[in-house]
C-alpha cells in the first residue's frame, strides 16, 4: 500500500525558518503535490506550495523554496514573521495525486523534544486519505 | 474530506445531447479551478474543458462550439452540457478541482467519473 511520509525541521539559524520533506513510497505516477498547513488541503488547511512533475511550481508566503529532491520526494522552506510565521505545533500536510488512481496525504509537524536543527530519519507517517 | 459525484453520463446516439453534472462538498468552492478530463478507452487523460476562479471558460480544441461548461456557486455545482456528440467523445468523464498552471487546470481532487457513450 502507497505511504507517505513528512518530516519537518526547524533550522538552527533562523528560529523562524522550517523545512519541510515530504516523500511518496509507492509505485504509481504522482501527477500533483500538495503541501498545507493547518490541516490537510481543501478541509481547513491552508495552500503552501503545489508542485507538478512537468508544468512546474507554485507557492504562497511564506513559503520561500519549494523544489523537487527527486521523482517521489519534495521539499518546502518556509520563513515568516508576525502572523504568517509558523510556530513550533503547527501541523504540515503532503499530499500526494495520482490521478486518476488515488490520492495519499499525510500530516506532521515539529517533534516537541526535537532541538532546532536537528530530527530523525524520516518514517513513513500514516495515511489519512486515500481515495 | 473533499468530495465530486459525478452524474448525467449515458448512451446517446451521435449528434445529441447529454448533461453532466458535479456535486461538490468538502471544500471552499471559489478555488483555483474547476473542471472535466475524460479518459477514452485505451486512451490517456484528456483535459476536456475548465472554468477558472474568474469564471472564465477553456476548453480543449476538439470540443469547441460544442460543450459548455458552467458553475453554480450557490449550488456548488459544476456543469458539462456536451452538444453535437460524436464517437470519438466517448470515455469516463471525471469532474476535477485543481490549481492552473498556465492554462492547464492540474487536478488536486476528483470524482468517481460517469461513462459517457456515443453509440447508435
Known amino acids: 500500500t502507497p505511504e507517505v511520509w513528512v518530516q519537518v525541521r526547524m533550522e538552527a539559524t533562523e528560529l523562524s525558518s522550517f523545512t519541510i520533506r515530504c516523500g511518496f513510497l509507492g509505485s504509481g505516477s504522482i501527477s500533483l503535490v500538495t503541501v498545507s498547513w493547518g490541516g490537510p488541503n481543501g478541509a481547513g488547511g491552508t495552500t503552501l506550495a503545489v508542485l507538478h512533475p512537468e508544468r512546474g511550481i507554485r507557492q504562497w508566503a511564506p513559503a520561500r523554496q519549494a523544489r523537487w529532491e527527486t521523482q517521489s520526494s519534495i521539499s518546502l522552506i518556509l520563513e515568516g514573521s508576525g502572523a504568517s510565521s509558523p510556530c513550533a505545533n503547527t501541523t504540515f500536510c503532503c499530499k500526494f495525486a495520482s490521478f486518476p488512481e488515488g490520492s495519499w496525504e499525510a500530516c506532521g509537524s515539529l517533534p516537541p523534544s526535537s532541538d532546532p536543527g536537528l530530527s530523525a530519519p524520516p518514517t513513513p507517517a500514516p495515511i489519512l486519505r486515500a481515495d | 474530506e473533499v468530495q465530486l459525484v459525478e452524474s448525467g453520463g449515458g448512451l446517446v446516439q451521435p449528434g445529441g445531447s447529454l448533461r453532466l453534472s458535479c456535486a461538490a462538498s468538502g471544500f471552499t468552492f471559489s478555488t483555483d479551478c474547476m473542471g472535466w478530463f475524460r479518459q477514452a478507452p485505451g486512451k490517456g487523460l484528456e483535459g476536456v474543458a475548465h472554468?477558472?476562479?474568474?469564471?472564465?471558460?477553456r476548453y480543449v480544441e476538439s470540443v469547441k462550439g460544442r460543450f459548455t461548461i458552467s458553475r453554480d456557486n450557490a449550488k456548488n455545482s459544476l456543469y458539462l452540457q456536451m452538444n453535437s456528440l460524436r464517437a470519438e467523445d466517448t470515455a469516463v468523464y471525471y469532474c476535477?478541482?485543481?490549481?492552473?498552471?498556465?492554462?492547464?487546470?492540474?487536478?488536486?481532487?476528483w470524482g468517481q467519473g460517469t461513462m459517457v457513450t456515443v453509440s447508435s
Open positions: 472554468i477558472d476562479s474568474d469564471g472564465i471558460p
Open positions: 476535477v478541482v485543481g490549481f492552473k498552471f498556465g492554462d492547464y487546470c492540474a487536478p488536486n481532487d
